[in-house]
């Protein structure tokens, strides 16, 4: 029986050009975590496998760093990075647990203020 729960950072925001840590935590189970996938709906960002280590998708190699821990760091954020991110924990003997994080990438404060400035 699957007793565990995934805790995530939920809905988060970050500034364009900045970085953010995507973090999930599996609790309330003694199951062994053997692999964690980080995904968007239609593509895989990274896999952390207990035996094989980290694999980062070539599409994200320049902007994604493994860790901390089983988390994932997204760098040089763009507005296009806004959206859902999923952590998928493969465990033994429970099976898979999944969590969702929604990231909103905002224009930087400077850009926001600039946008509000109007010439009289």
């Amino acid at each position: 029986m699957m007793t565990g729960t995934i805790e995530t950072t939920g809905n988060i925001s970050a500034e364009k050009g900045g970085s953010i840590i995507l973090q999930c935590h599996l609790s309330s189970t003694t199951a062994q975590v053997t692999q964690v996938n980080w995904e968007q709906q239609d593509q895989l960002l990274a896999i952390c496998n207990a035996d094989l280590g980290w694999h980062i998708s070539p599409s994200f190699k320049d902007r994604v760093a493994p860790g901390p821990g089983l988390g994932l760091t997204l760098q040089s954020l763009t507005v296009n990075d806004t959206g859902e991110y999923f952590c998928i924990y493969h465990t033994y003997p429970d099976g898979t647990y999944t969590g969702r994080i929604f990231l909103e990438v905002l224009e930087s404060s400077v850009a926001e203020h600039g946008a509000r400035f109007q010439i009289p």
């Epitope: 692999q35 996938n37 593509q43 896999i47 094989l52 694999h55 998708s57 599409s59 859902e84 969590g99």
Partner: antibody, heavy 121, light 107 residues
């Protein structure tokens, strides 16, 4: 239990359209993506595309853009795939499928029984 | 698109034998590969996901292994009911792609 019930076999004329349905039951319809897969007689499997019934958002295999249109009706928990400008190449069994986990990877744990579409004059 | 190649269209085996079906990806897909069984006239059935994880209720005679570009699906002791076509599929990126299938025939 999770079930995906597809509409019955269709015999259609070349150049026309057909709409295949996939009625979901046993789970919260809007929480899980629905995928569509094509299988020509005696052939392998081809992924057509995916729809998020909650938002209506979809993603298509480039090969099926302009051929397939995916929609979903939340009120009846039914996903639809419309195929247009039919030719003999579209004669196939079409499956709807659902991912195993709410936010899970694209492995397909639940499948409809398939709908045979035959295009013939 | 990522091409998944199953080099054997057919494999012949006997009940009780061990049989392995291979699948090769055209690029590194890490461990993002699933295996399905399709019996005549039926829908595909998920057996393995993420290369080596057995789906709920799947008998333990079915196993998967591999990473990167080379993957193997093994039946440790073939039963008569295992007569089917077996497909690999990458769940690494869109569009999802399947291998051409390997038909397992029982001698």
């Amino acid at each position: 239990q999770v079930q995906l019930q597809q509409s019955g076999a269709e015999l259609v004329r070349p150049g026309t359209s057909v709409k295949v349905s996939c009625k979901a039951s046993g789970y919260a319809f809007t929480n899980y993506l629905i995928e569509w897969v094509k299988q020509r007689p005696g052939q392998g499997l081809e992924w057509i595309g995916v729809i998020n019934p909650g938002s209506g958002g979809n993603n298509y295999n480039e090969k099926f853009k302009g051929k397939a249109t995916l929609t979903a009706d939340k009120s009846s928990s039914t996903a639809y795939m419309q195929l247009s400008s039919l030719t003999s190449d579209d004669s196939a069994v079409y499956f709807c499928a659902r991912r195993g986990d709410k936010y899970g990877s694209a492995w397909f744990a639940y499948w409809g029984q398939g709908t045979l579409v035959t295009v013939s004059a | 698109d990522i091409v998944m190649t199953q080099s054997h269209k057919f494999m012949s085996t006997s009940v009780g034998d061990r049989v392995s079906i291979t699948c090769k990806a055209s690029q590194d897909v890490s461990t993002a590969v699933a295996w399905y069984q399709q019996k005549p006239g039926q829908s595909p059935k998920l057996l393995i996901y993420s290369a080596s994880y057995r789906y709920t209720g799947v008998p333990d005679r079915f196993t998967g292994s591999g990473s990167g570009t080379d993957f193997t699906f093994t039946i440790s002791s073939v039963q008569a009911e295992d007569l089917a076509v077996y497909y690999c599929q990458q769940h690494y990126s869109s569009p999802r792609t399947f291998g051409g299938g390997t038909k397992l025939e029982i001698k």
